[in-house]
Amino acid sequence: ASTGETPNLGEVVVAEVGWDALKLNWTAPEGAYEYFFIQVQEADTVEAAQNLTVPGGLRSTDLPGLKAATHYTITIRGVTQDFSTTPLSVEVLT
């Protein structure tokens, strides 16, 4: 269990946008999180979000399997054993 305040995420940036995939970069303090929880939600639909997690040591991930010419809202949270950060979001058009 952590003591004191868990730091929040810095910023999230869509680094590369492809036809049906994109690359997500973010900043976060080293060693602060066990993993990052990422939700990829198609904008303006009630379709379920695609969820994935990446290890806490990473600051970048590819998001494959997206639709072309589609608006997405991407949300990322840092997670420890007993804490989850406020989500950071970014919008993108593939």
């Epitope: 929880f37 969820n51 994935l52 997690t53 494959p64 997670v79 054993q81 989850s84």
Partner: antibody, heavy 121, light 107 residues
């Protein structure tokens, strides 16, 4: 050592609901996803959905969307799977599991003992 | 949802044989792929995680390989206790999905 202990066997009528519990002990509960997997007699494994208790976010397989609800009680380290509108095809063994990959990349893989649900009129 | 196509659905082999089972993903996935062994009346047991990492306590005759869309489980020299049903599980992009299973029977 992590242990997942499930509730006992159930016999249900078609159209009713069943709620199966899965109590975790011996490890962190909140930040790891608990999945539910079922296996009908003589059939393969079928992933139904999962929840990360600390986030309160559940994910469901499309096949079960609208019929299954997965919840978690952090205070008792217990996850629940409720399946409604039961039909005979829902007769199966239901497993809870903490699977590698979805929420945390440790090399763990723990399964409950399974709960047999029989749907019969 | 990502579809996992596992082949073959069943195979007959003899003790000492080399056995290969394949799983194909309908789209590229990260290495979040596991291989499971299940015997009748028992919960599944994981053999391989992260596509190629051997689960602690699992004999080294089991190995996994692959990335992207194609993954393979190999049993280098089949033993009597290996006759069982094997499943792959894609667990990186939610919802997770299992392959249909491969039953390994005695020839």
């Amino acid at each position: 050592q992590v242990q997942l202990v499930q509730s006992g066997a159930e016999v249900k009528k078609p159209g009713s609901s069943v709620k199966v519990s899965c109590k975790a002990s011996g490890g962190t509960f909140s930040s790891y996803a608990i999945s539910w997997v079922r296996q009908a007699p003589g059939q393969g494994l079928e992933w139904m959905g999962a929840i990360i208790p600390i986030l309160g976010i559940a994910n469901y397989a499309q096949k079960f969307q609208g019929r299954v609800t997965i919840t978690a009680d952090k205070s008792t380290s217990t996850a629940y799977m409720e399946l409604s509108s039961l039909r005979s095809e829902d007769t199966a063994v239901y497993y809870c599991a903490r699977l590698y990959g979805y929420a945390y990349y440790g090399a763990f893989d723990y399964w409950g003992q399974g709960t047999t649900v029989t749907v019969s009129s | 949802d990502i579809q996992m196509t596992q082949s073959p659905s069943s195979l007959s082999a003899s003790v000492g044989d080399r056995v290969t089972i394949t799983c194909r993903a309908s789209q590229g996935i990260r290495n979040d792929l596991g291989w499971y062994q299940q015997k009748p009346g028992k919960a599944p047991k994981r053999l391989i995680y992260a596509a190629s990492s051997l689960q602690s306590g699992v004999p080294s005759r089991f190995s996994g390989s692959g990335s992207g869309t194609e993954f393979t489980l190999t049993i280098s020299s089949l033993q009597p206790e290996d006759f069982a049903t094997y499943y792959c599980l894609q667990n990186g992009l939610q919802p997770a999905t299992f392959g249909q299973g491969t039953k390994v029977e005695i020839k």
